[in-house]
């Protein structure tokens, strides 16, 4: 957890208490389950990893959002509601990070195994961009944040 959190951000705390992040959790869980069903294997091959290599140092611009994907009626409804909730955090990157960390923590017990946990984290990292929002900088979604062994 970051230092700013220890200092206490009352405005963020009240925002988090007001927010209903359940649709985000539902959307992400449905997405990873749907991907597992579709592929019958790990859908996140290295070529789909958000940290995959590129020769352009400015390639993954956190502020060039993509419009959100509406595949899957139930999931798109959850996604729309999720994006509306996350939109409340747009002007507070720290708070956006807190919200995403909260989603991760809320779902961590429901994720089965390391592979599903990694898939959930990858989808969670993509969520702000899918919603047309800025992805936070300096935001650790993992209690034990791990990168790839080779990079």
């Amino acid at each position: 957890r970051q230092q700013w959190e220890l200092q206490g951000d009352r405005r963020c705390q009240s925002q988090l208490e007001r927010a209903n992040l359940r649709p985000c959790e539902q959307h992400l869980m449905q997405k990873i389950q749907r991907d597992e069903d579709s592929y019958g294997r790990d859908p996140y091959s290295p070529s789909q990893d958000p940290y995959s290599p590129s020769q352009d140092p400015d390639r993954r611009d956190p502020y060039s959002p993509s419009p959100y994907d509406r595949r899957g009626a139930g999931s798109s409804q959850h996604q729309e509601r999720c994006c509306n909730e996350l939109n409340e955090f747009e002007n507070n990157q720290r708070c956006m990070c807190e919200a995403l960390q909260q989603i991760m923590e809320n779902q961590s017990d429901r994720l089965q195994g390391r592979q599903q946990e990694q898939q959930f984290k990858r989808e969670l990292r993509n969520l702000p961009q899918q919603c047309g929002l800025r992805a936070p900088q300096r935001c650790d979604l993992e209690v034990e944040s791990g990168g790839r062994d080779r990079y």
């Epitope: 957890r1 970051q2 230092q3 700013w4 940290y51 290599p53 590129s54 020769q55 352009d56 140092p57 400015d58 390639r59 993954r60 956190p62 502020y63 002007n91 507070n92 990157q93 720290r94 990292r125 800025r134 992805a135 936070p136 900088q137 300096r138 935001c139 650790d140 979604l141 993992e142 034990e144 944040s145 791990g146 990168g147 790839r148 062994d149 990079y151």
Partner: antibody
Amino acid sequence: QVQLVQSGPDVRKPGATVKVSCQTSGYRFTDYEMNWVRQAPGQGLEWIGLINPHSGDTAYAQKFQGRVTMTSDTSDSTVYLELSGLTPDDTAVYYCARSQGTFEVYYFVSWGQGSLVTVSS
Amino acid sequence: SYVLTQPPSMSVAPGTTASIPCGANNIAKKRVHWYRQKPGQAPVVVVSDDEDRSSVIPDRFSGSKSGDTATLTISRVEAGDEGDYYCQVWDSKTDHVVFGGGTKVTVL
């Protein structure tokens, strides 16, 4: 392309305050955090702190707490580093460096040319 | 606070492989980035745990991590690879950026 242009060299007496500027261009100023890193002669890189120009939030290295102030001016896309209570040990090249990455990925692709600050009586 | 430890210097023969270590507690769990600095110049990122490598850097540069050590590997070393190399991480516990002490690489 991204450009970070820093102010020129400065000489200060011990106990004084110095203010270094870093004017940016080639990207949306409020979208990326700016960091300050210094390098004393013959020494390694030392992180001083960062500022988020969008929110004004700052994070300073423990060592500099209490005598460093980072500010930004969105009207001309410039960030400033102010260091007070200078001692000869603060003699160094001061760099501004723009952040890159999201979430736990955080590093610097774009750097200023450096500003030499000399503290001498 | 989180500390990154690098050997102060190393010498390498041209055409061989150089491995520059960066040690820290459980560093394999961190995102590690590497910079090269030449005299009188600002540092340049050579390998990052984000995009593999920056566009101006040859693919002879690569990074790896295991346990308490991150390693920058330069294959087929050339005279132009001389410089000071620094590892860097962002430490989420303190919300601080941390640099290693640097390794001066000399090509024999």
